[in-house]
Every structure is written in structure tokens, then in C-alpha cells.
């Protein structure tokens, strides 16, 4: 139909356009006419695949007409101007607006020319991460929770951890129709070594410029883990006083320290000062096993240490730790 050997006109448009739920979006569509080519455009038409009729038409004499006048608008087309820009603005994007649209130019003498554009309706999710406080269960339990709320499409959640463990991810409908809330739990066997360590939740979504990283500091509640330090096996008579320290790791923090011996209460030369036990100089050898009992909200644990104070000063001063 057109004269042979002429460069053809081309409809230019992106293959895919993203828009955000509730926002407006422009579907760009232009007619590119090669330099020597002549064309006359009489109508611009937008239609949606799978729907009957056209949603927007710009007619050379009748101007614009829309299936939903409050939601659609030709951006640049005006009566009395060359109809080369069919770009269409859509307002108040809804989930059901997602789909394939056809932009069509009715031209002479080339005939109709069209292009398809896929409109993606996105919703930017809100992301939160929180610790799941646990006790020593001896079996795998969730220790951290990462939630991406109201995304479209669903967000992709991954975890980064040096502690081992595995994710458990689920989806549920979001508050707004067509959106999805993704919940991911990080699951491992709790131990005291895990307490205070961190894991990172990584949320990826096509609405983000870069992934969002959310760090969670883990909390594992456990009864005290107790040891006694301060004795080096070289304590002697007539030396300065020395100190034993009851080292306790626990969550929550210890609420009380109780010192005793295997024989019962502390001897007179041993004075309890909270987590520390002061051993005063003695004038005769002793062989005593001290017990430190530490309590927290989850229970009590104890450690024992046998202390010998020997005769004969060392060749070099060591013995009872000087203060």
C-alpha cells in the first residue's frame, strides 16, 4: 500500500512500565517518523488485552474520549496538533490495572501501527525485623523474625548468619488487595553461644534501589554458666590476702551469688563480697573446696574449686595474689 522503498514509521514504547499502587503512571508511546517519510495520524487508541473496546481514544476532530474519564488522560495529544505522542497517564493505580496494553496509531498512508506495553503494578513493602527471645529448648526454634508487609510482587527474604540455622518463610495476603506480606523466621537450636550474636535479614524487592538489610541481635535466655578464677595452685602461708572470682555468664543477668564450702558455711578467713571471695592470710595450711552458687531468673548453677594453702614460701614470690 505505501509507496515502495520508503522508510517505515515506528511506534516507540517501553516493553514494560512499573507503577505504584495508588499512584499515577504514564504509559509512554510515540510515533517515530523517519526524516523523508510523510505520515498523517488521525486517531490514537489505547486498549487493554482481554477487554472489549478501547479505554482511550484521541480522534482528530472529536478529541479525547475515555472509558474512565477520571482515571485516564492523554499527556500530550491536543486538537489541532500533529498526533505523534500517544502517551497516556493513569491515575490511582489499582492491582487490576496490571496487564498488557496496546497503543495504536491510525496513520495514512502507512495504515495502523501499534505496540504492546506491560504495566506492572507494584507496592513497596514495609520491612521490620525483630528478635524472638528464646530459652534453651534443645530443639530448633525461631530466634529472629523478618516481615515484609504489603509488597507487590512479594518481597524476597534471605538471611545471613555465621551461626548456622535455616529459614522458614511464609506468605499471606496483605492489607491492600493484591499485596502480599512475607514472614521469614530464622530457626536454630538455641545455645548460650548464640546469645548476643546477630543475624541479618536481607529483603529484596523490585521497588528498592538496593536490598534492605535488617540486623537482629539474638536473645537466648539461659541459666548461669559458672566457673571460679583467681587460683593458680601456688598459694602459701603468711602471704597477702587473695581473691577468688565467681565468673558467671547468664541471661538474664545473675540476681545473686552465694559462696559456701563443701563443709558448709565459709570459714572465718573467707569473706564473700558478691561475685568475689576474699581469702585472708592464714597461719596454717588449708585444703578447702569452695562453692559459688549463682542464681538468675531461670535457675541456679554452681562451680567448685579446691584451694590449698601450703607451707614454705616459694623461692620467688607468687602464692596468694597480692592486692
Amino acid at each position: 500500500w505505501p509507496p515502495p522503498g520508503t522508510g517505515d514509521i515506528i511506534v516507540q514504547a517501553p516493553t514494560q512500565v512499573p507503577g505504584f499502587l495508588g499512584d499515577s503512571v504514564t504509559l509512554p508511546c510515540y510515533l517515530q517518523v523517519p526524516g523523508m517519510e510523510e505520515t498523517h495520524v488521525s486517531q490514537l487508541t489505547w486498549s487493554r488485552h482481554g477487554e472489549s473496546g478501547s479505554m482511550a481514544v484521541f480522534h482528530q476532530t472529536q478529541g479525547p474520549n475515555y472509558s474512565e474519564p477520571k482515571r485516564l488522560e492523554f499527556v500530550a495529544a491536543r486538537l489541532g496538533t500533529e498526533l505523534r505522542d500517544a502517551s497516556l497517564r493513569m491515575f490511582g493505580l489499582r492491582v487490576e490495572d496490571e496487564g498488557n496494553y496496546t497503543c495504536l496509531f491510525v496513520t495514512f498512508p502507512q495504515g495502523s501501527r501499534s505496540v504492546d506495553i506491560w504495566l506492572r503494578v507494584l507496592a513497596k513493602p514495609q520491612n521490620t525485623a525483630e528478635v524472638q527471645k528464646v530459652q534453651l529448648t534443645g530443639k530448633p526454634v525461631p530466634v529472629a523474625r523478618c516481615v515484609s508487609t504489603g509488597g507487590r510482587p512479594p518481597a524476597h527474604i534471605t538471611w545471613h548468619s555465621d551461626l548456622g540455622g535455616m529459614p522458614n518463610t511464609s506468605q499471606a495476603p496483605g492489607f491492600l488487595s493484591g499485596t502480599v506480606t512475607v514472614t521469614s523466621l530464622w530457626i536454630l537450636v538455641p545455645s548460650s553461644q548464640v546469645d548476643g550474636k546477630s543475624v541479618t535479614c536481607k529483603v529484596e524487592h523490585e521497588s528498592f534501589e538496593k536490598p534492605q538489610l535488617l540486623t537482629v541481635n539474638l536473645t537466648v535466655y539461659y541459666p548461669p554458666e559458672v566457673s571460679i578464677s583467681g587460683y593458680d595452685n601456688n598459694w602459701y602461708l603468711s602471704q597477702n590476702e587473695a581473691t577468688l572470682t565467681c565468673d558467671a555468664r547468664s541471661n538474664p543477668e545473675p540476681t545473686g551469688y552465694n559462696w559456701s564450702t563443701t563443709m558448709g558455711p565459709l570459714p572465718p578467713f573467707a569473706v564473700a563480697q558478691g561475685a568475689q571471695l576474699l581469702i585472708r592470710p592464714v597461719d596454717k595450711p588449708i585444703n578447702t573446696t569452695f562453692i559459688c552458687n549463682v542464681t538468675n531468673a531461670l535457675g541456679a548453677r554452681q562451680a567448685e574449686l579446691t584451694v590449698q594453702v601450703k607451707e614454705g614460701p616459694p623461692s620467688e614470690p607468687s602464692g596468694m595474689s597480692s592486692n
Partner: antibody
Framework: EVQLVQSGSELKKPGASVKISCKTS????????MHWVRQPHGKGLEWIGG????????SYNQRFKGRVTLTVDKSTSTAYMELSSLRSEDTAVYYC?????????WGQGTLVTVSS | DIVMTQSPSAMSASVGDRVTITCKAS??????VAWYQQKPGQPPKALIY???YRYSGVPDRFTGSGSGTDFTLTISSLQAEDLAEYFC?????????FGQGTKLEIK
């Protein structure tokens, strides 16, 4: 008011040519493509072709195999259709019609009768 | 060529009736369909463009619908002045083609 006024009826012999005019007013002639459509008596409509007055660009229905020539005179805002090698089946009312994708204004029609 | 098949070819209806004329394209023409009314001894008059949009001044009892291959012209409440022949036309691709027409008579 947009008006398309066509020339009068024609009686032609087979093998002859006919040239019909379509004088326009009420709009800018060079901004709209002019097309031609014919209608044999009591029958349907058949598109012949179109021409853009500004560029001179044309498009023809291949059924007419080079028998049709469309021209314009911009100075008088007039379009012309010439049909050659006439045969009896070319007997019809010929319309000029302003093109807007569809045809929004039509001439009153010119009856061309081909008879020996 | 794209063939536009109109039905019925003729029909009779009473004033106030709802009248439906259909047009089927032999291939997809999108929404590039127009409807025309032709009264006896007159040229066609454009009613509908782009399948469903009324020309200004056309009474709203005339409604066009459809896309792809199936199109409908509906007159919601027939008036005496609607006595005419109605044609559909596709302008999706050359050569432009018309339906063979539906002659509407008033009972």
C-alpha cells in the same frame, strides 16, 4: 460548516475515463486525508483509495489495479478521482469522504453510469 | 482483505424497540471499527468511531461495542427517523472494508 460538494452525474462508455471533483470548505483542506468510496445501486460500500493533500501520499485498493488516480488542487481545496478503462460494473455512486480514521464527512455523491 | 460480515441483512422493528446489529470481522481489527447510517438518497453519516465512541451530535440511543472480531451497534429505543441502512467499517488495515449493510425498516 464542513462541506464536500461533488461534481454532477456522468454517463460514460465502456473503456472511457471519468474524473470526478470534490470541492471542500469549512475546514483546512491540507490537514485531512481525502478518500473515495463507491456504492453500486442497492449494494454495499467499497473503498477506492485516499490521498493526503499536503504530502500527496496515496493509498489505493489493489482491486482497481492502477485504474484509479487521485489528485488534489490545494489552491482550490479540491480533490479529484479519475477512473479509467471503465466497465459496466463500475456503474455506481462515487463519494468523496474526509478521513479521520473513519470517514466523518461525505460528499453528496456522483452517479457514474457506464453503458454502451 | 478483511471481510466484515453484517447480520441481519434486513430487519423490521417497531418504534421503541431495542435493535441490535452485529458485525463480524474475518480477523482481529482491534477497535478500529466505525458505524454509519445511510438514509435513502443520502450519503452515509458517521455514528460511531473506534467501536464504541459516539460522534458529537449522535443521539445516545446509539451505542457501539466490541473489539477484536465481534462488534455490535445497538439502538436502545427505535425512533421513526432511524429508518435507514447501517454499515460497519474496519480501518485496521488496507484495504478498508465495509459490511454489506443492514436495512432497518419500521413496522
Amino acid at each position: 460548516e464542513v462541506q464536500l460538494v461533488q461534481s454532477g452525474s456522468e454517463l460514460k462508455k465502456p473503456g472511457a475515463s471519468v474524473k470526478i471533483s470534490c470541492k471542500t470548505s469549512g475546514y483546512t483542506f491540507t490537514e485531512y486525508t481525502m478518500h473515495w468510496v463507491r456504492q453500486p445501486h442497492g449494494k454495499g460500500l467499497e473503498w477506492i483509495g485516499g490521498i493526503h493533500p499536503n504530502s500527496g501520499g496515496t493509498s489505493y485498493n489493489q482491486r482497481f489495479k492502477g485504474r484509479v488516480t487521485l489528485t488534489v488542487d490545494k489552491s482550490t481545496s479540491t480533490a479529484y478521482m479519475e477512473l479509467s478503462s471503465l466497465r459496466s460494473e463500475d456503474t455506481a455512486v462515487y463519494y468523496c469522504a474526509r478521513w479521520t480514521g473513519d470517514f466523518d464527512y461525505w460528499g453528496q455523491g456522483t452517479l457514474v453510469t457506464v453503458s454502451s | 482483505d478483511i471481510v466484515m460480515t453484517q447480520s441481519p441483512s434486513a430487519m423490521s422493528a417497531s418504534v421503541g424497540d431495542r435493535v441490535t446489529i452485529t458485525c463480524k470481522a474475518s480477523q482481529n481489527v482491534g477497535t478500529n471499527v466505525a458505524w454509519y447510517q445511510q438514509k435513502p438518497g443520502q450519503p452515509p453519516k458517521a455514528l460511531i468511531y473506534s467501536a464504541s465512541y459516539r460522534y458529537s451530535g449522535v443521539p445516545d440511543r446509539f451505542t457501539g461495542s466490541g473489539s477484536g472480531t465481534d462488534f455490535t451497534l445497538t439502538i436502545s429505543s427505535l425512533q421513526a427517523e432511524d429508518l435507514a441502512e447501517y454499515f460497519c467499517q474496519q480501518y485496521q488495515s488496507y484495504p478498508y472494508t465495509f459490511g454489506q449493510g443492514t436495512k432497518l425498516e419500521i413496522k
